[in-house]
Interface confidence: medium
């Protein structure tokens, strides 16, 4: 069983899923309002968003006291965060600016990918090996959307029987999408295109918030019960509480290299020939050059106009 990394508003913690009754280890303490969290295992980096400080920060998890600011301007409520461990990019949602943005892992070369028809975007999940990203929106027209990680091919994949879609996670091996709905109190799964939808846990969960997966087990945080729960990802059986009495459980991830499988990085050689951003794409050549917001890509499709 994995270590589970979760945001707890005041801190980030790690708890062993097999021994959840033990105290969790504080990875980073003294935070204001940590909401979303993710990591790049191969780089030893943990990222989180703080919705009170309106910032995204990171730390090296094998070093103490190494907190760095990554994004500190232009954020209002960065509720969702995801690391592209393959293309070495950072993606985030902001439910107040109503944007989904991308940048390098150090926060540089920031680009707004989506800014229209977003209401309350929350969870975001990446599948870098296929070039797709997924996010939930619990606004007036709740939905789950999919798009290329380069901002292309945006498509609504779930928009029925959905109310407060909070948690979202991908099963890379089985090619499945799982999500938790806090209003309808369930966990459902589907194919990555939204087809073949099935219930995993029917409407009995008080307030599921964030969701992750490791091997055959789903793990999620629940706001109402202040705990982390788990069940079998196929059947929903074996539903149990594995870690309780959490101050304010927010985002959660199975903290393991297994959750960030290696694959060919189409941007790996010479940044794909791109002068600035090289983003994963679902269509050949499986990457797309891009420029920071406000800077134009020249007709060669590789170079950003001077001044970026």
């Amino acid at each position: 069983a994995p270590l589970l990394l979760y945001a707890n508003r005041r801190d980030l913690r790690l708890v062993d899923a097999t021994n959840g009754k033990e105290n969790a280890t504080i990875v980073v303490g003294g935070l204001e309002d940590a909401a979303a969290v993710d990591f790049v295992f191969s780089h030893g980096l943990i990222y989180w968003s703080d919705v009170s400080e309106e910032a995204i920060k990171r730390t090296e998890f094998n070093k103490t006291e190494s907190v760095q600011n990554v994004v500190v301007s232009g954020l209002l409520s960065p509720d969702g965060l995801a690391c592209d461990w393959l293309g070495e990019k950072l993606y985030w949602t902001d439910s107040e600016t109503n944007r989904i943005e991308v940048s390098n892992l150090d926060g540089s070369l920031r680009k707004v990918l989506f800014w229209q028809e977003l209401d309350q975007p929350r969870a975001i999940a990446l599948d870098p090996s296929s070039g797709f990203m997924y996010w939930t929106d619990w606004g007036e027209v709740p939905k789950i959307e999919r798009a290329g990680m380069d901002g292309s091919s945006r498509f609504i994949i779930i928009n029925s029987e959905i109310y407060w879609p909070n948690g979202l996670t991908l099963d890379y091996e089985e090619q499945k999408l799982y999500w938790a709905d806090a209003k309808l109190n369930f966990i459902h799964k589907s194919n990555l295109d939204g087809t073949n939808r099935q219930a995993v846990v029917k409407g009995s969960l008080p307030h599921p918030f964030a969701l992750t997966l490791f091997e055959d087990i789903l793990y999620w945080t629940d706001w109402s019960t202040h705990s982390i729960l788990a069940c079998n990802k196929y059947t929903g059986e074996g539903l149990r509480e594995i870690h309780s009495d959490i101050f304010s459980p927010m985002d959660i991830h199975a903290f393991s290299q297994q959750r960030q499988p290696n694959a060919t990085n189409p941007c790996g050689i010479d940044n794909g020939g791109c002068s600035h951003l090289c983003l994963m794409s679902p269509v050949k050549p499986f990457y797309q050059c891009a420029c920071p917001t406000g800077v134009k890509l020249l007709e060669n499709g590789k170079t950003c106009k001077d001044g970026a």
């Epitope: 008080p206 109402s224 101050f247």
Partner: antibody, heavy 121, light 107 residues
Framework: QVQLQQSGAELVKPGASVKMSCKAF????????IEWMKQNHGKSLEWIGN????????KYNEKFKGKAKLTVEKSSSTVYLELSRSTSDDSAVYYC??????????????WGQGTSVTVSS | DIVMTQSQKFMSTSVGDRVSITCKAS??????VAWYQQKPGQSPKSLIY???NRHTGVPDRFTGSGSGTDFTLTISNVQSEDLADYFC?????????FGGGTKLEIK
């Protein structure tokens, strides 16, 4: 509709224990915590603690640890508050309320009518 | 513990007036503040959650504002039925704490 029904007024002798109830109607009992408050006759409200019927998780205000005990009877959707070793300081009205989670907040939305406790010999 | 201070214990107003009741937190509580109304002989009733959001069924003459440490409940066009005690609550950190209350009196 959502309703919390509290047990009737109690007259308690000093040193004795008193147990009051809060019965929930009109919603899924295990989906929400029950919060308990004390209101002195001087009108200020104090949070005693909460009980979540989904996982029996209990949180107490340090001030009331050893004084208050929260328990549940799930079959009747009832949460109980027991006060031990009563003193005149425990004379007050005790309210239960449903702890409500919206999708980015929690607060107390529905309140019981209150149980008045008087400690007197 | 976080202390919520309602400095005005009593406020006097007339029907049709606008009145603002304030609450100050001893530390930053973001916007995790709720307001409750308690009429004589009744239990508290939820008015405002998350500092500025009206609960279902609450008249729009009740408005909440503020974040961080300073919060205000404003009642515009005061009605005689608004005679009550008003409490603020912070649920940013345990233990949850209430303000001491402000009694609204109608002249």
């Amino acid at each position: 509709q959502v309703q919390l029904q509290q047990s009737g007024a109690e007259l308690v002798k000093p040193g004795a224990s008193v147990k009051m109830s809060c019965k929930a109607f009109g919603y899924t009992f295990t989906s929400y915590p029950i919060e308990w408050m004390k209101q002195n006759h001087g009108k200020s409200l104090e949070w005693i603690g909460n009980f979540h019927p989904y996982n029996d998780n209990t949180k107490y205000n340090e001030k009331f640890k050893g004084k208050a005990k929260l328990t549940v009877e799930k079959s009747s959707s009832t949460v109980y508050l027991e006060l031990s070793r009563s003193t005149s300081d425990d004379s007050a009205v005790y309210y239960c309320a449903r702890g409500y989670s919206g999708n980015y907040f929690s607060a107390m939305d529905y309140w019981g009518q209150g149980t008045s406790v008087t400690v007197s010999s | 513990d976080i202390v919520m201070t309602q400095s005005q214990k009593f406020m006097s107003t007339s029907v049709g007036d606008r009145v603002s009741i304030t609450c100050k937190a001893s530390q930053n509580v973001r916007n995790d503040v709720a307001w409750y109304q308690q009429k004589p002989g009744q239990s508290p009733k939820s008015l405002i959650y998350l500092a500025s959001n009206r609960h279902t069924g609450v008249p729009d003459r009740f408005t909440g504002s503020g974040s961080g440490t300073d919060f205000t409940l404003t009642i515009s066009n005061v009605q005689s039925e608004d005679l009550a005690d008003y409490f603020c609550l912070q649920h940013w950190n345990y233990p949850y704490t209430f303000g001491g209350g402000t009694k609204l009196e109608i002249k």
